[in-house]
């Protein structure tokens, strides 16, 4: 058993049918010595008396808010949560496996640049009685500071019969140098509590591996005289790291017909302009990627050919 | 239709072209190592990230773009002295800092070159003959060093008398390639920045 926060405790249980559970001793936070009784949650049934209460915690029915009283007055509370270990592996009931980029990906994180700021998000089908708390650091043995905000509900989607909820959090490394070569990964730890169930999820990454630039901005077309060709131009996104000559991007320019089945023409360039043939009803899209370290491509920025 | 990227004119800054080749070569070598050594811990998540140049060179600090020198988090610089004549210095106005930067890059390359050559000698003794260093990568390191053209003491190739542990050598190769790829990215950024300046 360990303390999650003041008066909230997590009991770790080896979870299998007929498991013996864990013996837990609760102590009433009071100078009083006698006349103390204990109850669980809203029930008025007295579970025991005395300054300490010994309970065998086996299932969720044994978890909850234990309260010690004296003469009708509440003295203190202890909330017991359960953390299930199923065959040597901690349970992952609360969050959905996003399966991207690989199986068992519960937390996904992205950064728009090398400033040390990043966003993480996760999915759940649970709508109520749910709380998250996020901590982060650079490295784990001698951790350096990363400050995270509060997790917020950022999107709701309907997936088949189920509603899916997306939560996200923004974090910022306290003293980040955009040009630094990372040798210690960023660690992100999310504590999730649903009713009386506690779970924790972690992710470990280098900022360089989670970079996803914003799409190029100011995408414009300039028709070339006496030709079906157009000059496409764009600019680096505002959120990208500067100077751009150091933090360079490479671009992919795509000409896509109205129908998804039509052949796509693609050109790769390090410049912020390209000459392409603009077909009727087609659209021109441009996306960006770090020129030297192949992390994710940005989303597409698009303009119609007409 | 995937069109290759046109190589920029290297005339103004000859090192840019070489540094791009270096990044390509080390990335290819790392990919090959990860595929060939699939039963070894060779992914970024599995290895320890060690920097063999740590406390010996200070490339990141010495090559910091001017715009980032205002960022206090970037100024954890270390005092290191370097030789300051090099053929990549296209203009006489080149600052002492730029000379320091390029000589730091040169020292990095020299250190990695020695490590890779020592390692290759060990890998050639492996009866499994599982993996060797790409000669192209070694050649590209050499070309960039020549383009930088710094006079510096030659570091003798390390030789070891004990029987090599091939498992450890292959893991060390992965560690080295990951670190060198990161340094090659920094070198490319620096060359691109200097080229634009």
């Amino acid at each position: 058993i360990w303390e999650l926060k003041k008066d909230v405790y997590v009991v770790e249980l080896d979870w299998y049918p007929d498991a013996p559970g864990e013996m837990v001793v609760l102590t009433c936070d009071t100078p009083e010595e006698d006349g103390i009784t204990w109850t669980l949650d809203q029930s008025s049934e007295v579970l025991g008396s005395g300054k300490t209460l010994t309970i065998q915690v086996k299932e969720f029915g044994d978890a909850g808010q234990y309260t010690c009283h004296k003469g009708g007055e509440v003295l203190s509370h202890s909330l017991l949560l359960l953390h299930k270990k199923e065959d040597g592996i901690w349970s992952t009931d609360i969050l959905k496996d996003q399966k991207e980029p690989k199986n068992k990906t519960f937390l996904r994180c992205e950064a728009k640049n090398y400033s040390g700021r990043f966003t993480c998000w996760w999915l759940t089908t649970i709508s109520t009685d749910l709380t998250f708390s996020v901590k982060s650091s650079r490295g784990s043995s001698d951790p350096q500071g990363v400050t995270c905000g509060a997790a917020t509900l950022s999107a709701e989607r309907v997936r088949g019969d189920n509603k899916e909820y997306e939560y996200s959090v923004e974090c910022q490394e306290d003293s980040a140098c955009p040009a630094a070569e990372e040798s210690l990964p960023i660690e992100v730890m999310v504590d999730a509590v649903h009713k009386l169930k506690y779970e924790n999820y972690t992710s470990s990454f280098f900022i360089r591996d989670i970079i996803k630039p914003d799409p190029p901005k100011n995408l414009q077309l300039k028709p070339l005289k006496n030709s079906r060709q157009v000059e496409v131009s764009w600019e680096y996104p505002d959120t990208w790291s500067t100077p751009h000559s150091y933090f360079s991007l490479t671009f992919c320019v795509q000409v896509q017909g109205k129908s998804k089945r039509e052949k796509k023409d693609r050109v790769f360039t390090d410049k912020t302009s390209a000459t392409v043939i603009c077909r009727k009803n087609a659209s021109i899209s441009v996306r960006a990627q770090d020129r030297y370290y192949s992390s994710s491509w940005s989303e597409w920025a698009s303009v119609p050919c007409s | 239709r995937n069109l290759p990227v046109a190589t920029p004119d290297p005339g103004m800054f000859p090192c840019l072209h070489h540094s791009q080749n270096l990044l390509r070569a080390v990335s290819n070598m790392l990919q090959k190592a990860r595929q060939t050594l699939e039963f070894y811990p060779c992914t970024s998540e599995e290895i320890d990230h060690e920097d063999i140049t740590k406390d010996k060179t200070s490339t990141v600090e010495a090559c910091l773009p001017l715009e980032l020198t205002k960022n206090e988090s970037c100024l954890n610089s270390r005092e290191t002295s370097f030789i300051t004549n090099g053929s990549c210095l296209a203009s006489r106005k080149t600052s002492f800092m730029m000379a320091l930067c390029l000589s730091s890059i040169y020292e990095d390359l020299k250190m990695y070159q020695v490590e890779f050559k020592t390692m290759n000698a060990k890998l050639l003794m492996d009866p499994k003959r599982q993996i060797f260093l790409d000669q192209n990568m070694l050649a590209v390191i050499d070309e960039l060093m020549q383009a930088l053209n710094f006079n510096s003491e030659t570091v003798p190739q390390k030789s070891s008398l004990e029987e090599p542990d091939f498992y450890k050598t292959k893991i060390k190769l992965c560690i080295l390639l990951h670190a060198f790829r990161i340094r090659a990215v920094t070198i490319d950024r620096v060359m691109s920045y200097l080229n634009a300046s």
Epitope: P17, D18, I89, D93, K104 | F39
Partner: antibody
């Protein structure tokens, strides 16, 4: 006393369907994940499928994906395996089993797929 | 396809020490716990070892398990006639959990 009692096995023709049941008693069935494991005659153990305690997630072996469906009725304390498009290679003893460091197995039920 | 490899058979005379190996990889045994089962003819498997080296109550102490890196082993010190059975190791793969990964199985024969 934890008990898992299996039923529903038998002889079936290729291409036909069969449903296996596993009745649980002696524990809070709705709190635990459950597996199906099979063993072809003279062969080793092969995992077939898993279902979470609340039925929210199901996982299948590639060899049965799209043909077999694992389900549970927590109000009846029963686990099911619906097998469709049966093949000769599905012939095996099928076991249900609890998920956890200490597990309990059903007695097994024989499924024979033969024309 | 079995990812955990066991020897097809091992044998010993009563009182001898018999060991069965179970070889896997970094993503399974290297990252997860190992169990061992005993299966007597015509019966369901019985748990012998859980979490690499733990014995459930009721399992004789002549059975012991260990794990090192990407391999595990089961030892029977002082093998007895009633130990003649098939033995299976089981683990998980970090990418496909909760799918159970079973070893190929080992037939233990007690001679004499």
């Amino acid at each position: 006393q934890v008990q898992l009692v299996q039923s529903g096995g038998g002889v079936v023709q290729p291409g036909r369907s069969l449903r296996l049941s596993c009745a649980a008693s002696g524990f809070t069935f709705s709190s635990y994940g459950m597996h199906w494991v099979r063993q072809a005659p003279g062969k080793g153990l092969e995992w077939v499928a898993f279902i979470r305690y609340d039925g929210s997630n199901k996982y299948y072996a590639d060899s049965v994906k799209g043909r077999f469906t694992i389900s549970r009725d927590n109000s009846k304390n029963t686990l099911y395996l619906q097998m469709k498009s049966l093949r000769a290679e599905d012939t095996a003893v099928y076991y249900c089993k609890t998920h956890g460091s200490h597990d309990n197995w059903g007695q097994g039920t024989m499924v024979t797929v033969s024309s | 396809s079995y990812v955990l490899t066991q020897p097809p058979s091992v044998s010993g005379t009563p009182g001898q020490r018999v060991t069965i190996s179970c070889s896997g990889g970094r993503s399974n045994i290297g990252s997860n716990t190992v169990k061992w089962y005993q299966q007597l003819p015509g019966t369901a498997p019985k748990l012998l070892i859980y979490v690499n080296d733990q014995r459930p109550s009721g399992v004789p102490d002549r059975f012991s398990g260990s794990k090192s890196g990407t391999s595990a082993s089961l030892a029977i010190t002082g093998v007895q006639a009633e130990d003649e059975a098939d033995y299976y190791c089981q683990s998980y793969d970090r990418g496909t959990h909760p799918a159970l990964l079973f070893g190929t199985g080992t037939k233990v024969t007690v001679l004499g």
